[in-house]
């Protein structure tokens, strides 16, 4: 007995053939001998059959000594044993349906959990094997689970059913909606413009939720929620913002978010937090802003950084063109009597200048001038 | 001299239901399959499913699956279509038509009903 | 479901010309087709079937060839009746498809 596998709403054409290239007398049964279509001359018949608005053949095959049997639209239930009689003779074929789905919707928040499910036909012992698109192989049986999805597991996953060593392959298109990074910086001198910036990893028809940027200023003791937004069909509407500092945002994606000054009461850590309409669970990106401040009192000329530097990083005062006078992994550097000159304050990391500031001193008789 | 007369005209509100009528005479009505065939206003033609007088066995176009109805009553030499759930785009000229077995292996259409108005709005 | 795609969908002609519609199918349909008629107002007639086969009492002046995907209707002579929509129809599948339509129009 020849086995087909179908898959669930596909089209599936049982083959049978007689041995006369011609258009000769034939008829499809099922394992009850139900008769689900055949011929009469050239007219197509059907039968009693479930399957009457599903089933088709092609007469164009039938002088070819070719009488198909298509069935459209496949169902589990179709999973069964046809039964072709063609000149006197009898071919049998299996048809077993399978169907593979996401558990629940095929658009998953970061970190949360994928589960496929196989629909099988009752008796069949199929087994499972899925490929991610990052490459990663899962195998199961009638369920397969992946815990913590990650930003690379969207895309097409490619699932592989196998059932009497006969294979059928199954596409699904995971999205995993999440931001762009996880994490990101800003560095930036006392006074500059701050740009926030929240791409997505993810495109959406229709998107739709609301949002918060929660803040934890350094000098701080607690977090505050700077600004509340609502995302109405990629629309940004804002809906509650604090009055400092005042934010502002962009009313169209990627969310973007403006603080007008860079100052030290602002450097710190943020939390934007986006919900999904439908989706339970939240999107969530940390931005972080440093701010750096150089300035001459009296005799002294100190350059510092607010807000969360890694201890790796080094700060550093140096009069233009000159050797480094002063170098520490501190986010504080000064220098006594400085002399005259465009002095440079550097934050960096292995050699990379990520913020610089620069100050002009003049000779002691008159005040610094800051470019 | 083989004739299809279809029932007239028909206004009905989205989400009702219309069945029509198609009276065969003038040959053997279990002999022929009837068709019904759509065609929306000023758009092309689309066939809906065929029924086969003689047995009753009917097929419908996967578009109107579970909404088309067709049946036949052979006292009468009639067969009916009814098109449950309309909305407005199911207004059209409905016609019926019968499949021809001289030639076309009972599926091209050698008579044809005048046609039935179906118009549903609200 | 198989398609059929009809070029051009509308065509000016004046009385005498000769004219071609095509008829393409989505997959080889050997010689199950059929060609149409239709009037404003009015249910199409049957011109030709087997996709050369001119119906009766349909003047010799249509006919049609092709086999497998490509087929055409050809009218000789054109006609001050003959202005008109013309549709093809696939019958190899028992899930019947026609063409999108040629209006055949007066120049």
């Known amino acids: 007995k020849k086995v087909v596998l179908g898959k669930k709403g596909d089209t599936v054409e049982l083959t049978c053939t007689a041995s006369q290239k011609k258009s000769i007398q034939f008829h499809w049964k099922n394992s009850n001998q139900i008769k689900i279509l055949g011929n009469q001359g050239s007219f197509l018949t059907k039968g009693p059959s479930k399957l009457n608005d599903r089933a088709d053949s092609r007469r164009s095959l039938w002088d070819q000594g070719n009488f198909p049997l298509i069935i459209k639209n496949l169902k589990i239930e179709d999973s069964d044993t046809y039964i072709c009689e063609v000149e006197d003779q009898k071919e049998e074929v299996q048809l077993l349906v399978f169907g593979l789905t996401a558990n629940s919707d095929t658009h998953l928040l970061q970190g949360q959990s994928l589960t496929l499910t196989l629909e099988s036909p009752p008796g069949s012992s199929p087994s499972v094997q899925c490929r991610s698109p990052r490459g990663k192989n899962i195998q199961g049986g009638k369920t397969l689970s992946v815990s913590q999805l990650e930003l690379q597991d969207s895309g097409t996953w490619t699932c592989t059913v196998l059932q009497n060593q006969k294979k059928v392959e199954f596409k699904i298109d995971i999205v995993v909606l999440a931001f762009q990074k996880a994490s990101s910086i800003v560095y930036k001198k006392e006074g500059e413009q701050v740009e926030f910036s929240f791409p997505l990893a993810f495109t959406v028809e229709k998107l739709t939720g609301s949002g918060e940027l929660w803040w934890q200023a350094e000098r701080a003791s607690s977090s505050k929620s700077w600004i509340t937004f609502d995302l109405k069909n990629k629309e940004v509407s804002v809906k509650r913002v604090t009055q400092d500092p005042k934010l502002q945002m962009g009313k169209k994606l990627p969310l973007h978010l403006t603080l007008p000054q860079a100052l030290p009461q602002y450097a710190g850590s943020g939390n934007l937090t986006l919900a999904l309409e439908a989706k339970t669970g939240k999107l969530h990106q940390e931005v972080n802003l440093v701010v750096m401040r150089a300035t001459q009192l009296q005799k002294n000329l100190t350059c510092e950084v607010w807000g969360p530097t890694s201890p790796k990083l080094m700060l550093s005062l140096k009069l233009e063109n000159k050797e480094a006078k002063v170098s520490k992994r501190e986010k504080a550097v000064w220098v006594l009597n400085p002399e005259a000159g465009m002095w440079q304050c550097l934050l960096s990391d292995s050699g990379q200048v990520l913020l610089e500031s620069n100050i002009k001193v003049l000779p002691t008789w008159s005040t610094p001038v800051q470019p | 001299q083989v004739q299809l007369v279809q029932s007239g005209a028909e206004v009905k509100k989205p989400g009702a239901s219309v069945k029509v009528s198609c009276k065969a005479s003038?040959?053997?009505?279990?002999?022929?399959?009837i068709s019904w065939v759509r065609q929306a206003p000023g758009q092309g033609l689309e066939w809906m499913g065929i029924i086969n007088p003689s047995g009753g066995s009917t097929s419908y176009a996967q578009k109107f699956q579970g909404r088309v109805t067709m049946t036949r009553d052979t006292s009468t030499s009639t067969v009916y279509m009814e098109l449950s759930s309309l909305r407005s785009e199911d207004t059209a000229v409905y016609y019926c038509?019968?499949?021809?077995?001289?030639?076309?292996?009972?599926?091209?259409?050698?008579?044809w009903g005048q046609g039935t108005l179906v118009t549903v709005s609200s | 479901d198989i398609q059929m795609t009809q070029s051009p969908s509308s065509l000016s002609a004046s009385v005498g010309d000769r004219v071609t519609i095509t008829c393409r199918a989505s997959q080889d349909i050997s010689n199950y087709l059929a060609w149409y008629q239709q009037k404003p107002g009015k249910a199409p007639k049957l011109l030709i079937y087997a996709a050369s086969i001119l119906h009766s009492g349909v003047p010799s002046r249509f006919s049609g060839s092709g086999s497998g995907t490509d087929f055409t209707l050809t009218i000789s002579s054109l006609q001050p009746e003959d202005f008109a929509t013309y549709y093809c129809?696939?019958?190899?599948?028992?899930?019947?498809?026609f063409g999108q339509g040629t209006r055949l129009e007066i120049k």
């Open positions: 038509a019968r499949a021809t077995g001289l030639y076309c292996s009972g599926s091209c259409f050698d008579y």
């Open positions: 129809q696939q019958y190899d599948s028992s899930f019947i498809t």
């Open positions: 003038g040959g053997t009505f279990s002999s022929y399959a």
